[in-house]
């Protein structure tokens, strides 16, 4: 058993039918010695008396808010949450496995640049009685500071019969140098509580591996005289690290017909312009990627050929 | 501690091409190692990230773009001094700081070259003959060093009398390749910046 925050305790349980459970001793936070009784949640049934209460915690019915009283007056509370260990693995019931880039990916994180700012998000099908708290650091043995905001509900989606809720959080490394070569990963820890169930999720990454630039901006077409060709030009996104000659991007230019089945023409360039043939009813899209470290491509920025 | 904006004319920077080749070569070698050593801890998540140049060179700090010198987090660096003549410096106006930066890159390459050659000698003794270092990568390191053309005493290749532990050698290869790829990215960024300045 360990303290999550004041008066909230997590009991770690080997979780299988008929498991023996854990013996927990609760102590009433009071100088009083006599006449103390204990109750659980809203029930008035007295579970025991005395300054301490010993309970065998085996299932969710044994968790909840334990209260010690004296003469009708509440002396203190202890909220017990359960952390299930199924076959030796901590349960992951609250969050949905996003399965990208691999199984057991519950947290996904992205950064728009090398400033040390990043966003993480996760999914759940649970809509009520749910709280999250997020901590982060650079490295774990001698952790350096990363400050995270509060997790917020950022999207709701309908998936088949289920509603899916997306939560996200923004974090900023306290003293980040964009040019630094990372040797210690960023660690992100999310505590999730649903009713009386506690779970924790972690993700470990280097900023360089989660880079996903914003799409190129100011995408423009300039027709070339007496030709079906057009000059496409664009600019680095505002959110990308500077100077651009140091933090260079590479670009992919795509000409896509109206039908998804039509052949796509693709050109790769380090410049911020390209000459392509604009077909009728086609659209031109451009996306960006770090020129030297192949992390994710940005989303496409698009303009119609017409 | 930074690169000045007044540097050689655009396109006149002979090291840019070599540094691009270097990044391509080390990335290919790392990919090959990860595929060949699939049952070894060779992914970025599995390895310890060690930097053999730590406390010996200070490439990131010495090659910091001018724009980032205002960022205090980029300036908590170590003092290191280097030899300061080199043929990538295509203009006499090149400052001492830029020479420091390029000589730091040269020292990095020299250190990695020695490590890779020592490691290759061990891998050639492996009866499994599972993986060797790509000769193209070693050649590209050499070409960039020649383009930088710093006079520096040669570091003798390390030789070991004891029987090599091939498992450990292959894991060390993965660690080295990951670290060298990261350094190659920095070198490419620096060369691109100098070329544009």
């Amino acid at each position: 058993i360990w303290e999550l925050k004041k008066d909230v305790y997590v009991v770690e349980l080997d979780w299988y039918p008929d498991a023996p459970g854990e013996m927990v001793v609760l102590t009433c936070d009071t100088p009083e010695e006599d006449g103390i009784t204990w109750t659980l949640d809203q029930s008035s049934e007295v579970l025991g008396s005395g300054k301490t209460l010993t309970i065998q915690v085996k299932e969710f019915g044994d968790a909840g808010q334990y209260t010690c009283h004296k003469g009708g007056e509440v002396l203190s509370h202890s909220l017990l949450l359960l952390h299930k260990k199924e076959d030796g693995i901590w349960s992951t019931d609250i969050l949905k496995d996003q399965k990208e880039p691999k199984n057991k990916t519950f947290l996904r994180c992205e950064a728009k640049n090398y400033s040390g700012r990043f966003t993480c998000w996760w999914l759940t099908t649970i809509s009520t009685d749910l709280t999250f708290s997020v901590k982060s650091s650079r490295g774990s043995s001698d952790p350096q500071g990363v400050t995270c905001g509060a997790a917020t509900l950022s999207a709701e989606r309908v998936r088949g019969d289920n509603k899916e809720y997306e939560y996200s959080v923004e974090c900023q490394e306290d003293s980040a140098c964009p040019a630094a070569e990372e040797s210690l990963p960023i660690e992100v820890m999310v505590d999730a509580v649903h009713k009386l169930k506690y779970e924790n999720y972690t993700s470990s990454f280097f900023i360089r591996d989660i880079i996903k630039p914003d799409p190129p901006k100011n995408l423009q077409l300039k027709p070339l005289k007496n030709s079906r060709q057009v000059e496409v030009s664009w600019e680095y996104p505002d959110t990308w690290s500077t100077p651009h000659s140091y933090f260079s991007l590479t670009f992919c230019v795509q000409v896509q017909g109206k039908s998804k089945r039509e052949k796509k023409d693709r050109v790769f360039t380090d410049k911020t312009s390209a000459t392509v043939i604009c077909r009728k009813n086609a659209s031109i899209s451009v996306r960006a990627q770090d020129r030297y470290y192949s992390s994710s491509w940005s989303e496409w920025a698009s303009v119609p050929c017409s | 501690r930074n690169l000045p904006v007044a540097t050689p004319d655009p396109g006149m920077f002979p090291c840019l091409h070599h540094s691009q080749n270097l990044l391509r070569a080390v990335s290919n070698m790392l990919q090959k190692a990860r595929q060949t050593l699939e049952f070894y801890p060779c992914t970025s998540e599995e390895i310890d990230h060690e930097d053999i140049t730590k406390d010996k060179t200070s490439t990131v700090e010495a090659c910091l773009p001018l724009e980032l010198t205002k960022n205090e987090s980029c300036l908590n660096s170590r003092e290191t001094s280097f030899i300061t003549n080199g043929s990538c410096l295509a203009s006499r106006k090149t400052s001492f700081m830029m020479a420091l930066c390029l000589s730091s890159i040269y020292e990095d390459l020299k250190m990695y070259q020695v490590e890779f050659k020592t490691m290759n000698a061990k891998l050639l003794m492996d009866p499994k003959r599972q993986i060797f270092l790509d000769q193209n990568m070693l050649a590209v390191i050499d070409e960039l060093m020649q383009a930088l053309n710093f006079n520096s005493e040669t570091v003798p290749q390390k030789s070991s009398l004891e029987e090599p532990d091939f498992y450990k050698t292959k894991i060390k290869l993965c660690i080295l390749l990951h670290a060298f790829r990261i350094r190659a990215v920095t070198i490419d960024r620096v060369m691109s910046y100098l070329n544009a300045s």
Epitope: Y16, P17, D93, K104 | -
Partner: antibody
Amino acid sequence: EVQLVESGGGLVQPGGSLRLSCAASGFTFSDYGMVWVRQAPGKGLEWVASISSGSSNIYYADTVKGRFTISRDNAKNTLYLQMNSLRAEDTAVYYCARNPYWGQGTLVTVSS
Amino acid sequence: DIQMTQSPSSLSASVGDRVTITCKASQNVGTNVAWYQQKPGKAPKGLIYSASHRYSGVPDRFSGSGSGTDFTLTISSLQPEDFATYYCQQYNSYPLTFGGGTKVEIK
């Protein structure tokens, strides 16, 4: 007493469908992840699919992905395995399990 | 996928013998290994989880050990009811995979 009882097995033609059920009792079913495991005649054990307590996380073996669907109804204390496009190699005894307890199994025979 | 290689595939032993079955994972699985017992015509039954933890009610003559890639199930003193087939399983990553089984027969 913990009990897991499978049903729904039988003889089916290749390409056909079956729905297996597993009735759970003796424990709080809704608090536990569940799995289906199968055993071809005279062979070893093969994991088929897993589902978390609240159905948010589901995993399948590659051999059944896209053909089988694991689901559960916590109100009915029942685990299901919907099997479509059945093949001869799906012939096996199918067990539902929540360690350390396994059901007695139900035999699925796919044959023309 | 992670392969679990169990050995031996069968063994003959007498009541009172100490029996050791080994299981080798093709890559590191930490301690996420379970052991099962299956008697002819019956369903398997869980014995060990997390490589070395016995489920409640499992006799203490059964013990498990190991981590990483090498795991062992030991029966310290074989009893008549222990003649069965034993399987190891890794659940470190999906797909979950079982060993081929070890049949423990009466000598």
